[in-house]
């Protein structure tokens, strides 16, 4: 599927089939300064025995041959999901007893900045991506993933933590954003909508996709997530949009087929190891990158976001399974678990490819409004 007004070689399209549909043009006025109220807040968590504070439940990294899940979470607060918001909302809910990040959910009061002051920061995530405003950065090389192909054993923990479905990843999954920018994958989780309602966190020219996968990584410069929180580049998230396609996605089916087992909030199961890279687009060379935050409390900033230009295709049935199987707290469906897009506040999104060049007949000449901050090599 292509976004409206997509160019021939436009960013963001064509799932792992390889064709590149760009994210669309970016000549619209920026709405960075007005976060949309109609989009719910998001959340994201990192792996571990307990859910960490926010968008990513972040674990402590331990030596590889420890227990099957080797990564243990810090003693961070657990996260609560929202009741099934009929309309996405911009605030997170906390249980009355908690004044920390341990209890929040999508929708309702109190506002997230009262859950965690960082949520009111100037450089938050997610954001709306406007390809024509992105700065082409030749220095952004193809991402490198190593060790993402996992044998069936040891098995991995798949958990409904009340605000997402999260797969805890074992040690040894290495990712490089570039020379000297090395990370270890901790966990992955998904964000989705509801029937007929898209639920990606990031948007492209205001277009929201059906769902979004986040693979959360910790910089190798840090041994533990709590050390990396808020530090520039301490955490990195690979994000990809999920779209509807004609065929079942066999990689995702290995996870989606197990969701019924963890329908209840707080439940978990073990799933055979799989090729984690198969859950991502095949084109690691075309992406958008910017510095933002966790999309749930504590909303820590300094997170490097890499959003693939290419999308991943799932069947309609698979997308329905994702959005219609899990339950959150209070007998509510776990749906619409995404945060509103946040203002860029002067941030420039970089692109690893000339995303702002419109090859369609409308454009007399390429338009690239921002220049790359990092010099090319």
């Amino acid at each position: 599927q292509r976004l409206p007004r997509m160019q021939e070689d436009s960013p963001l399209g064509g799932g792992s089939s390889g064709e590149d549909d760009p994210l669309g043009e970016e000549d619209l006025p920026s709405e960075e300064d007005s976060p949309r109220e109609e989009d719910p807040p998001g959340e994201e968590d990192l792996p571990g025995e307990e859910d960490l504070p926010g968008e990513e439940d972040l674990p402590e990294v331990k030596p590889k041959s420890e227990e099957e899940g080797s990564l243990k979470l810090e003693d961070l607060p657990t996260v609560e999901a929202p009741g099934d918001p009929q309309e996405p909302q911009n605030n997170a809910h906390r249980d009355k007893e908690g004044d920390d990040q341990s209890h929040w959910r999508y929708g309702g009061d109190p506002p997230w900045p009262r859950v965690s002051p960082a949520c009111a920061g100037r450089f938050q995530s997610p954001v709306d991506i406007r390809p024509q405003l992105a700065a082409f950065c030749p220095a952004l090389r193809p991402l490198e993933l190593l060790g993402f192909q996992l044998p069936p054993l040891p098995e991995l923990r798949l958990r409904n933590n009340g605000h997402s479905v999260q797969l805890t990843l074992p040690p040894g999954l290495e990712m490089a954003l570039g020379p000297g920018r090395e990370y270890r994958a901790l966990q992955l989780h998904l964000h989705w909508g509801a029937a007929g309602r898209p639920g990606s966190e990031h948007t492209v020219e205001g277009h929201r996709f059906p769902a979004e996968i986040h693979v959360v990584h910790l910089s190798t410069a840090f041994a533990r997530v709590d050390e990396a929180l808020g530090r520039p580049g301490g955490l990195a998230v690979l994000a990809a949009f999920l779209e509807e396609g004609p065929e079942e996605n066999s990689a995702y089916e290995q996870l989606l087929s197990r969701l019924e087992e963890i329908a209840e909030e707080g439940s978990e199961t073990q799933v055979p190891g799989l090729d984690i890279s198969a859950l991502l687009p095949s084109d690691f060379s075309r992406y958008f990158q910017y510095e933002g935050s966790l999309t749930t409390p504590p909303c820590a900033q300094g997170v490097i976001w890499t959003v693939f230009n290419q999308t991943v295709m799932l069947s309609a049935k698979q997308l329905h399974t994702l959005s219609d199987t899990l339950w959150g707290p209070g007998d509510s469906r776990l749906q619409l678990n995404f945060r509103a897009t946040q203002p860029l506040n002067g941030r420039v999104i970089e692109a690893s490819f000339p995303a702002g060049v419109d090859s369609s007949p409308r454009a007399a000449e390429p338009v690239q409004l921002n220049s790359c901050l990092a010099a090319g090599d």
Epitope: E67, E68, L146, G147, P151, P152, L153, E155
Partner: antibody
């Protein structure tokens, strides 16, 4: 410290059966996948079978599929390999091993001889 | 014949450096599955020497190192010692066979 103590090997006739055991200690047994690996006399290592920590998933080499059954009793911290319809080519030292990042701990091995 | 191919034997004098290769295919090492190495001293059970391509378990001397490139992996031993005389096996996972696979083993002789 991690220990895997094996028992149950011996001499058996072709077509016969044997059950190997592997008693584990020093770690949370149910948290780990386990495996059986064998080594024929003078030969190299051959993976035989593996089982997930919960026991819910099992895997077999083609050479033993349908004849061998791997199982575990997490309440007893014990891994088993039930070997049926044994053949001469099954003669080997059988090792149990903990499957984490690689097979990180091994039992002492037990010899299974299939001969008439 | 093993799925992963190793030289049957290698040798070196004390203090020297030797490498043992392990060649696979696009369904195992080349697909990105991790490679592990084991040392088996005569009459004993194998011992994990290198895991996940390059990592040493605690207690394994720094003289042992692993690397991987394409469809092959290598084990390097520097400062060879008499007690290194043993059989060495590489191991990975094969997605076509849906099985954990070993190399045929390499006998290291310290001259």
């Amino acid at each position: 410290q991690v220990q895997l103590v094996q028992s149950g090997g011996g001499l058996v006739q072709p077509g016969g059966s044997l059950r190997l055991s592997c008693a584990a200690s020093g770690f949370t047994f149910s948290s780990y996948a386990m495996s059986w690996v064998r080594q024929a006399p003078g030969k190299g290592l051959e993976w035989v079978s593996a089982i997930s920590g919960s026991g819910g998933s099992t895997y077999y080499a083609d050479s033993v599929k349908g004849r061998f059954t791997i199982s575990r009793d997490n309440s007893k911290n014990t891994l088993y390999l039930q070997m049926n319809s044994l053949r001469a080519e099954d003669t080997a030292v059988y090792y149990c091993a903990r499957a984490a990042a690689g097979f990180d701990y091994w039992g002492q091995g037990t010899l299974v001889t299939v001969s008439s | 014949q093993s799925v992963l191919t190793q030289p049957p034997s290698v040798s070196g004098a004390p203090g020297q450096r030797v490498t043992i290769s392990c060649t696979g295919s696009s369904s195992n090492i080349g697909r990105g599955y991790n490679v592990h190495w084991y040392q088996q001293l005569p009459g004993t059970a194998p011992k994990l020497l290198i895991y996940d391509d390059t990592n040493r378990p605690s207690g394994v001397p720094h003289r042992f190192s692993g690397s991987k490139s394409g469809t092959s992996a290598s084990l390097a031993i520097t400062g060879l010692q008499a007690e290194d005389e043993a059989d060495y096996y590489c191991q990975s996972y094969d997605s076509s066979l849906r099985a954990w696979v070993f190399g045929g083993g390499t006998k290291l002789a310290v001259l």
